[in-house]
């Protein structure tokens, strides 16, 4: 099945160019997506080419300009944020990252009524987060660990919490492994739905062991960076959730929520927070042993000014076969009834749907079936519901935006996306404005990304907002390579691969092949999305075949995939990989005596797992910023799929399951490996002890290190990794360079 | 230069009416969210009242229950009817979308409010 749509080829072949490496590292082939800043039902914020931030009003068709270029200049701005009373936007400048999500910056206020900077009680800097409230225009900011409030952008700060405490107590913003496994955000803090109340979390770090590494910087010693970092079977962070009144604050100051007792027995994660009304709650939380999942509806005692969850608003999750969820245990979307919900878990088949839930869980009303995942919810109105699924044509890399009517009975389900744009579209997510009046579809592939504006009642597409007119043109003279996406049936088990071939593919002649692996829990690489990367070059320029292949362990195609790897990370993963290379083998065009795989991270474990695999497939291989054993990465992540590193749960799985332990396979291949020594998320000490095993068992590799490099090992650091894997993979093949 | 045209200023007593209109021309929508603002002598303009595109009305605090923001679709005008005025009402009107086309008023319409 060939994914890149037609084009007219151009009769004189040699206009066409193939992909060089420069391109990849220029990004001269990236793509736009657009996603409308909603601020209404109809209108949207957009910043413009020449920055200056626009007004769209859909259905009076028109557009103007409240706040120019010229402004956000003045202060470096990078980011902006209306108040949703329309009186103020935030100025955000100084960017500076510190891990995945979060980031610290200065904001400016600017008062849009006399086009003046807010002066008086200007903000302190650097902050942590910012946000307006969701109605009027509250502040509420953290800096220095501390939540703060203010009822106007120019009144002085009302200080909500004072226990804050650089790596010790963090208040309204997660730590690290709560911000990187569990939160996958910077902020730790919810208005209610009218900003009558600020809920947030506290994480108290004071136990946890911390991972400490040098960061080298230009001084005459090296700086130490410390982050309290549980690793698996560690102590981990202590949360608990408070909510105050913004109105009072002083009244009675925070008031805690209390935990379910289930879960307050041993060691618990909270996992999010949903606000229902200004006066109803609902938190999630999680067992260590991340198999049990409580989520528990809170409402507000006027008369004791307290938060009150009673067990009747109890509903359990469990898993009896792998974890709670998938990656993430999955949120509500509530009802207009404001009690009942919608959620995504575990049909009995195993397939993870969309359930309603008035009472119980037990007596949850399944909304969506079949041998396919329902994947997100975007939004619930009062007549309509929609989510996106990989059901169309049963391709389970494939995203499509459904609406199922539930002001009628029986329900009747409605794809939206299917049959817009069918060759070039098949992966879409979607951005819906308030009450689902309008809504944004971005499709990411498989050809060239295109966002349109849809509306809310009868799907019509009102306009075009972005469709990468340049990037077509430019790619007009580019000989791209082939895509296509099909499935091997092994042992009953059916694997997803992408194939991306050279532009003049010729079954007959022999390739050499590179396997790109993640292979991850809940995670999927064979996604029919548009890219033009580092393996496209390799497939246009230098003639590889670069096969993408997900295994168990993978996402969307039910549980039995999924939670094959449960307590068994690094078996199933690997094996699959190297099935797939033998059925690649017997396609015929493959040089076997030519084949590599290569990946990051979690693709980095799979890739030395299968190098040192013992098998001879493998000619060479490169592993970036590998984990190398499941002792060294983080508690909430491991654990979840994983249990625990002690005697009577599972440590011989975790002792076997490392790339230490294989060190004397590595002797018959060709081993790359890469890290950065400023990595927070996957320690440079999993490859410190790569080496030290290889070393020992007197095995010969080669190495790169980034030093002051963090996971993504960013800026000039891609061009020379890049150039450095090409050139190590040419030699490997046996390619002139 | 914005196309919008305040009118309806005028000196009235404490405790007295007024009732302001902004008639929109050429290719400004009244259907947009709409807003009032003012600027009293010596200080910085502020808003007053915004109705939004789907007729919801929101208020300064100094004006809630006395000031009442509405508009004509047909005639292209919004209105802001004043009660209960007080002397710290005095101010030039300014009528604009909401959030204000940047940089961009008209002439206003002044209110004065004698004790």
């Known amino acids: 099945i060939v994914l890149r749509p037609s084009r007219v080829h151009n009769s004189e072949e040699n206009t066409m160019r193939a992909l060089t490496l420069k391109d990849i590292l220029n990004g001269t082939f990236s793509y736009k997506t657009f996603f409308p800043n909603w601020i209404s039902g109809q209108e949207y914020l957009h910043q413009s080419a020449d920055n200056n931030i626009v007004l769209y009003n859909i259905e009076t068709g028109q557009s103007y300009t409240i706040l120019s270029n010229r402004t956000m200049k003045s202060v470096n701005a990078s980011n902006y944020g209306l108040s949703p009373d329309r009186q103020f936007v935030y100025l955000e400048s100084d960017y500076s990252k510190l891990w995945r999500y979060s980031y610290t910056a200065t904001y400016y206020i600017y008062d849009l009524s006399n086009g003046e900077f807010v002066r008086g009680n200007e903000l302190p800097r650097p902050i942590q987060y910012l946000c307006w409230s969701p109605v009027g225009s509250k502040l509420a900011y953290v800096y220095q660990n501390n939540i703060y409030l203010k009822q106007r952008p120019g009144d002085p700060p009302f200080q909500i919490t004072f226990n804050g405490r650089e790596n010790k107590i963090f208040n309204g913003i997660p730590d690290w492994v709560y911000e990187e496994e569990m939160l996958a955000t910077k902020y730790a803090l919810w208005w209610s739905p009218n900003g009558k109340f600020l809920a947030y979390a506290e994480f108290n770090d004071t136990d946890i062991p911390v991972i400490a590494y040098s960061y080298y910087g230009d001084e005459q010693y090296p700086r130490t960076i410390n982050i309290p970092y549980p690793k698996a079977g560690a102590k981990n962070p202590v949360v608990r959730i408070f909510i105050i009144d913004t109105t009072y604050p002083a009244y009675v100051g925070p008031q805690e929520v209390p935990v379910p007792a289930m879960i307050a027995s041993s060691d618990y994660y909270f996992s999010w927070l949903t606000w229902v009304t200004d006066e109803r709650v609902c938190l999630q939380w999680l067992k260590r042993v991340q198999n049990v999942s409580v989520l528990s509806i809170c409402d507000f005692r006027e008369d004791w000014q307290t938060w009150d969850c009673p067990k009747t608003q109890e509903h359990i999750e469990e898993s009896r076969t792998g974890w709670a969820g998938g990656f993430f245990v999955s949120t509500p979307v509530f009802s207009y009834d404001a009690i009942s919900y919608y959620k995504i878990f575990s049909d009995k088949d195993g397939y993870k749907h969309i359930h309603y839930i008035k009472d119980t869980v037990e007596n949850a009303i399944q909304i969506t079936s079949g041998k396919w995942e329902a994947i997100n919810i975007f939004r619930v109105t009062q007549d309509s519901l929609f989510y996106s699924s990989n059901e169309f044509e049963e391709y389970p890399g494939r995203r499509n935006i459904y609406r199922i009517s539930i002001g009628s009975y029986p329900p009747s389900k409605k794809c939206v996306t299917c049959h817009l744009r069918k060759e070039r579209c098949q992966y879409y997510t979607a951005s819906f404005s308030d009450y689902a009046k309008y809504y944004a579809l971005v499709c990411y592939g498989p050809g060239i990304p295109i966002s349109t504006l849809h509306d809310g009642r009868t799907d019509q597409e009102i306009k075009i907002l972005e469709e990468n007119k340049e990037l077509e043109n430019a790619l007009k003279n580019i000989q791209l390579p082939k895509e296509e996406i099909k499935k091997l049936e092994v042992d009953e088990i059916t694997l997803w691969y992408k194939m991306i071939l050279p532009p003049q593919f010729d079954r007959s002649k022999k390739y050499p092949l590179l396997i790109q692996v993640y292979g991850g829990p809940c995670s999927q690489s064979v996604r029919s999305v548009f890219a033009v990367n580092w393996i496209s070059y390799l497939a246009s320029k230098e003639g590889m075949v670069i096969a993408l292949v997900d295994g168990r362990g993978t996402a969307f195609q039910g549980d039995k995939l999924l939670y094959a790897v449960y307590r068994k990370l690094g078996v199933y993963e690997v094996e699959d990989q190297i099935t797939a290379v033998r059925k690649f083998i017997e396609m015929g065009f493959i040089d076997e005596k030519r084949i590599a795989i290569w990946g990051w991270s979690y693709g980095g474990y799979v890739s030395s797992l299968a190098l040192a695999s013992g098998t001879g497939l493998f000619k060479c291989g490169i592993a970036v910023a590998p984990v190398s054993s499941w002792e060294y990465y983080a508690s909430v992540y491991t654990e979840r799929f994983m249990g625990l590193p002690t005697k009577d749960d599972n440590l011989e799985h975790y002792k076997n399951s490392t790339v230490m332990a294989r060190a004397e396979y590595f002797r018959n291949v060709d081993y790359l490996l890469i890290h950065g020594t400023a990595d927070d998320n996957v320690h440079f000490q999993n490859s410190a002890q790569i080496a030290k095993a290889l070393v020992n068992a007197q095995v010969d590799f080669q190495a790169m290190w980034y030093s002051d490099q963090n996971h993504g090992l960013s800026g000039l650091s891609t061009n020379h990794l890049y150039t450095h894997m090409t050139h190590f993979l040419k030699q490997c093949f046996s390619l002139s360079d | 230069q914005v196309q919008l045209q305040e009118s309806g200023g005028g000196l009235v007593q404490a405790g007295g009416s007024l009732r302001l209109s902004c008639a929109a021309s050429?290719?400004?929508?009244?259907?947009?969210?709409m807003g009032w603002y003012r600027q009293a002598p010596g200080t910085r303009r502020e808003w007053v009242a915004t109705?939004?595109?789907?007729?919801?009305?929101n208020y300064a605090d100094s004006v809630k229950a006395r000031f009442t923001i509405s508009r004509d679709n047909a005639k292209n005008t919004v209105y802001l009817q004043m009660n209960s005025l007080k002397p710290e009402d005095t101010a030039v009107y300014y009528c604009?979308?909401?959030?204000?086309?940047?940089?961009?008023w008209g002439q206003g319409t002044q209110v004065t409010v004698s004790s």
């Open positions: 604009n979308l909401a959030p204000p086309i940047f940089g961009s």
């Open positions: 109705i939004t595109t789907d007729g919801r009305t």
């Open positions: 050429g290719s400004i929508d009244i259907r947009n969210a």
